[in-house]
Interface confidence: low
Amino acid sequence: GYKAEVMVSQVYSGSLRVLNRHFSQDLTRRESSAFRSETAKAQKMLKELITSTRLGTYYNSSSVYSFGEGPLTCFFWFILQIPEHRRLMLSPEVVQALLVEELLSTVNSSAAVPYRAEYEVDPEGLVILEASVKDIAALNSTLGCYRYSYVGQGQVLRLKGPDHLASSCLWHLQGPKDLMLKLRLEWTLAECRDRLAMYDVAGPLEKRLITSVYGCSRQEPVVEVLASGAIMAVVWKKGLHSYYDPFVLSVQPVVFQACEVNLTLDNRLDSQGVLSTPYFPSYYSPQTHCSWHLTVPSLDYGLALWFDAYALRRQKYDLPCTQGQWTIQNRRLCGLRILQPYAERIPVVATAGITINFTSQISLTGPGVRVHYGLYNQSDPCPGEFLCSVNGLCVPACDGVKDCPNGLDERNCVCRATFQCKEDSTCISLPKVCDGQPDCLNGSDEEQCQEGVPCGTFTFQCEDRSCVKKPNPQCDGRPDCRDGSDEEHCDCGLQGPSSRIVGGAVSSEGEWPWQASLQVRGRHICGGALIADRWVITAAHCFQEDSMASTVLWTVFLGKVWQNSRWPGEVSFKVSRLLLHPYHEEDSHDYDVALLQLDHPVVRSAAVRPVCLPARSHFFEPGLHCWITGWGALREGGPISNALQKVDVQLIPQDLCSEVYRYQVTPRMLCAGYRKGKKDACQGDSGGPLVCKALSGRWFLAGLVSWGLGCGRPNYFGVYTRITGVISWIQQVVT
């Protein structure tokens, strides 16, 4: 019997260049008569062009929706009704080839061709792309608020904000032919629900989406996006009603930046330079191809690539890489954005060097990628430390914290978080090392205390990069480093003269002079600690809600003891900058740290002084009794305390705490409290300091109140941000 052929709609989008017409501003206004008349003619021409080819039998409908420069560019879409079995045969490439062939066949023809009656179409300027019915619907929904802008070389064009009566707007952007467009988006409100999508073509084609951003992102307050060429579209979808534009858009044409380099590395270890995608930190463009060739001076070395919040992974089944494709020595790897540091180590087996290629495989792109490169010793990649094969990083070994995701840095330890005597491998606690009293059989714990030693897990690194054996030598009144750097920046950690904490006692004025109260509209929200003349440290989760993200809301009080009254030693500050740790993850509480820059420097007094910051190697021994302070609730679910409370807590071994919290405790966390419970931090203490007293009498910041199950519950310890785990970021920001 006869079976009707199944027909399917195939949608195409594209543009063509008209050589005998010129673009005028009238053509940007859809309501103008010039626009109406030009679209009528262009539409007729487009239909005639398609129906002049063998595609004519499949023609269904078409529309010219916009015009641009060049001398005149028409932007259109059309639909063909194709028999299902021919669908794959009529790819955009085939359709473009058929139309170009038709145009070329009539270039020198004197015969009258309907589609050439008014327009001289440039065969080389025809572009056909795959689209969908959904794309056309998206385009049509923006036509009531459609803006075309041409931006010239050397120009930076600020785009007019959206029409708030519309629910969706489209900015159609065009630049000079051989340049690429760079769009800058800056969020100007703390919270919104607006959505912006950027496309690598003139209209909202899903398959050519570069990126989409949503809702006044705090982690990315400024986004710069590169198109692969001189055309781009930005679509806005309205969020909450607002009379203010929650963003500012500006666009500029930029020249193509070559992304190829040949480098010869020096005969030294550690970072030697940076490779990055063009216009970093802009998003890389959809057709980025970088090729970096690095020559290594000797086969003793391997090449290390240190990434920030980006990792390389093997991709199964040849699927395309959605966040950048890498080929390194013929190995194909896919990039993946992560909230962690990562290093790729490339063993070198030949002097020919190493070629690293980076390609954006699909139109969807992401933040620019930057990588530090350098050499490592192939026979000893991590001197004094452990090479974590999972992420390529060197991590402390046998310090009681599983820094490597697979925990191998804490396996096979003869002495964990203790010093191993040379003579007989007995273990002694770290404070006994270089304390002037021999504890090892032949006194090996007291050897090399006055000289430099190889750097390791518990050694302190001096400013001149040499290391000393004595644990925690900072600010103890005795210079241990040759350059004396262990005794620098020591105006910290001393209590003043003084006569959410559960189970605590009231503090007196000047007892905890680094304690900060972070307030919004006169209400205490979080604790914090003064760490430098203009910097207060606190927990990132204090700013979790969008409504808390703006610096203008916050006031920082120092020298405060009572919430309901002021005393002469108390001072207040506004916040000029708020920086959350770039790896902070709300769900896991990882990297729960933020820095507030005060609007003016503190004047130090008996009531206002900074706490000491520990070095990365500072060891806070489990079992040590430390103190937490804050105005948090005195019982779970209770109101905040009027008086600054203090309570002693015991530092808990990481593996014990990790087990209690079902392995949600990361290396950036530290636990303190008692199995008995009772003494703990509570709501309102967040971000406040956990401090431990060194033998010198100075107080060092060990942690920040972060999270925990309830307050003071038996068997559930308080979990704190481990300062030694985030100290490099703190130092990078503060200095």
């Epitope: 002495c415 079992g623 015991q650 593996d655 014990l656």
Partner: antibody, heavy 118, light 107 residues
Framework: QVQLVQSGAEVKKPGASVKVSCKAS????????MHWVRQAPGQRLEWMGR????????TYSPKFQGRVTIIPDTSANTAYMELSSLRSEDTAVYYC???????????WGQGTLVTVSS | DIQMTQSPKSLSASVGDRVTITCRAS??????LAWYQQKPGQSPKLLIY???TRHSGVPSRFSGSGSGTDFTLTISSLQPEDFATYYC?????????FGQGTKLEIK
């Protein structure tokens, strides 16, 4: 200095109960857990249970659950252990000890010999 | 309950010797392990806790190591007053449990 002084030796008949006291000096029992541990002749140490005198919260070893009761008298800075339904295998030296929260028992009483015999 | 097994059960050594006693837990106790010394007719005395931390007043010749399930008590140079019975105890979870003891005798 820290001291735990226990009551004197006891001889009991099977089925009876015994109550041993442990008086602390040099520290406040409310700040610590108070434990009871016993040691039968030639045997290993056996943990019986503990109390948090601050709120009288107790944790007992399943082996002694139902037979042992530990109670505090914070005003006298003393802890008591009562063991009921005595049998001959309960003959042992009973020790009280203190611990700070997570740590093990750092100070012990001198021990009280309880003999169960008919 | 977590079972604690000590070895050896008894040990003869001379003054000045280096002695090692081991303790194995039937499951992971992280570093929550203590060592006690007990002399006849006396109550136990705490030597080491958290596997490696010496209790105040304990001579430096006593040291502890290990984590997870395997632990060691080392006496680097035996003194006459060290001859006693040594017990390990896990303070990881209740009911707290002790090893059966290691009796250290004079050779």
């Amino acid at each position: 200095q820290v001291q735990l002084v226990q009551s004197g030796a006891e001889v009991k008949k099977p089925g009876a109960s015994v109550k041993v006291s442990c008086k602390a000096s040099g520290f406040n029992i409310e700040d610590y857990y108070m434990h009871w541990v016993r040691q039968a002749p030639g045997q290993r140490l056996e943990w019986m249970g503990r109390i948090d005198p601050e709120d009288a919260e107790t944790t007992y070893s399943p082996k002694f659950q139902g037979r042992v009761t530990i109670i505090p008298d914070t005003s006298a800075n003393t802890a008591y252990m009562e063991l009921s339904s005595l049998r001959s295998e309960d003959t042992a030296v009973y020790y009280c000890a203190r611990s700070i929260y997570l740590d093990p028992m750092d100070y012990w009483g001198q021990g009280t010999l309880v003999t169960v015999s008919s | 309950d977590i079972q604690m097994t000590q070895s050896p059960k008894s040990l003869s050594a001379s003054v000045g010797d280096r002695v090692t006693i081991t303790c194995r837990a039937s499951q992971d106790v992280t570093t929550a392990l203590a060592w006690y010394q007990q002399k006849p007719g006396q109550s136990p005395k705490l030597l080491i806790y958290w596997a490696t931390t010496r209790h105040s007043g304990v001579p430096s010749r006593f040291s502890g190591s290990g984590s997870g399930t395997d632990f060691t008590l080392t006496i680097s140079s035996l003194q006459p007053e060290d001859f006693a019975t040594y017990y390990c105890q896990q303070h990881y979870s209740t009911p707290y449990t002790f090893g059966q003891g290691t009796k250290l005798e004079i050779k």
